[in-house]
Interface confidence: medium
């Protein structure tokens, strides 16, 4: 079995982690998804799961965790707010259907949270559609009023992959008629 390479996210206490996990929509559109933590040497800990019906866009909040699931975009977005040093660890997006083994979606996330002052330069991850194997790092000055890792930056012109582009209602059902423009 393939072991997917980890993606390391280095953040500072108080920041928000945003991760986007693409999934194979033809296989997993109707499946429950979850965000799990992988404690060393222990069973995976399921932190938050999507709610039925899995074929419709949904948003689930569980403490500091938020799952935004949009099957029409073949994307599961995870947010962890107000990060603390104790949140450091290994996380993953999965297809969750106990008692079956979870299916890992994309690269596991190695989160490293450190204490930091408001006047240091910290790497900020722009978790948009990936251009490369590694997350995109942008060095930016951190301020207490700006605590999220996602920024309003122009979409890089090289980002042309489309997991999906919207839902059209056909005969009262969710039918995704997608343009795959590049």
């Amino acid at each position: 079995a393939i072991v997917l390479e980890e993606e390391r996210y280095d953040l500072v206490e108080g920041q928000t982690l945003t991760v986007k996990c693409p999934f194979n929509i033809m296989k997993y559109a109707n499946s429950q998804k979850a965000w799990q933590r992988l404690p060393d040497g222990k069973e995976p800990l399921t932190l938050v799961v999507t709610q039925r019906p899995f074929t419709r866009p949904s948003e689930v909040h569980m403490g500091k965790f938020t799952l935004k699931h949009d099957p029409s975009e073949a994307m599961l977005q995870v947010q962890m707010t107000d990060l603390q040093v104790t949140d450091s660890g290994l996380y993953r997006c999965v297809i969750y259907h106990p008692p079956n083994d979870p299916v890992v979606l994309f690269h596991p996330v190695r989160l490293v949270v450190t204490k930091g002052s408001s006047d240091v330069f910290t790497p900020v991850i722009i978790p948009i559609t990936r251009l490369t194997e590694r997350p995109i790092l942008i060095t930016t000055k951190y301020s207490p009023s700006d605590t999220t890792t996602t920024r309003s930056l122009p979409k890089p012109t090289a980002v042309v992959s489309s997991p999906g582009l919207g839902v059209t209602i056909i005969n009262g059902t969710d039918a995704d008629s997608v343009s795959t423009s590049s």
Epitope: K27, S31, D176, V178
Partner: antibody, heavy 126, light 107 residues
């Protein structure tokens, strides 16, 4: 025996229409997403369109969007591709291919296109 | 869209020798990659999915490896029936895309 059989190809003038069919047998058709893939003479494979098991999710390549329509009839175990406003560059062998089952917890589920038909030739020429 | 680049375009190998085919993705597709074999006048046949899992009935001499952006199909000892065109395909993102193919021919 698991099988896909395409039909409906032929010679058509530019701007014309054709409807391709793909008859499935030997498996539970309604559990699988289905796809159309084409191959122009002497060229590589090009994905054309996909449809999920219950027709909720439909995808098209840019090159055919607005001209081609994929559909399926699970009661008849059939997949279709309605092709309108045909162009010379649509000339190709069209294959239907079985995609993954929606039931990922089926340990035998395969994620790619595991079953292909023999193909049907579509020629667009005046 | 995800561009898959296969190399080499043509590979000349003697029967019994090892063949190594490469597929590079323009951005990471995890392990959502398949390999197909196509012989003249025939439909493609699935060899490998999930980057490394052999499809039913595929001989053990075919193996796939890699994840992310770099993938390899290895045929450990080429048999006469293995001379064909091989395509990789990613199925994580739409549009689903295929590589341009590698033709494995007899040296």
């Amino acid at each position: 025996e698991v099988q896909l059989v395409e039909s409906g190809g032929g010679l058509v003038k530019p701007g014309g229409s054709l409807r391709l069919s793909c008859a499935a047998s030997g498996f539970t058709f309604s559990s699988y997403s289905m796809n159309w893939v084409r191959q122009a003479p002497g060229k590589g494979l090009e994905w054309v369109s996909s449809i999920s098991s219950s027709s909720n999710y439909i995808y098209y390549a840019d090159s055919v969007k607005g001209r081609f329509t994929i559909s399926r009839d699970n009661a008849k175990n059939s997949l279709y591709l309605q092709m309108n406003s045909l162009r010379a560059e649509d000339t190709a062998v069209y294959y239907c291919a079985r995609g993954p089952s929606q039931y990922y917890y089926d340990s035998s589920a395969i994620e790619a296109f595991d079953i292909w038909g023999q193909g049907t030739m579509v020629t667009v020429s005046s | 869209e995800i561009v898959l680049t296969q190399s080499p375009a043509t590979l000349s190998v003697s029967p019994g020798e090892r063949a190594t085919l490469s597929c590079r993705a323009s951005q990471s597709v995890g392990s959502n990659l398949a390999w197909y074999q196509q012989k003249p006048g025939q439909a493609p046949r699935l060899l490998i999915y999930g980057a490394s899992t052999r499809a039913t009935g595929i001989p053990a001499r075919f193996s796939g490896s890699g994840s992310g952006t770099e993938f390899t199909l290895t045929i450990s000892s080429l048999q006469s029936e293995d001379f064909a065109v091989y395509y990789c395909q990613q199925y994580l993102y739409f549009p689903l895309t295929f590589g341009g193919g590698t033709k494995v021919e007899i040296k």
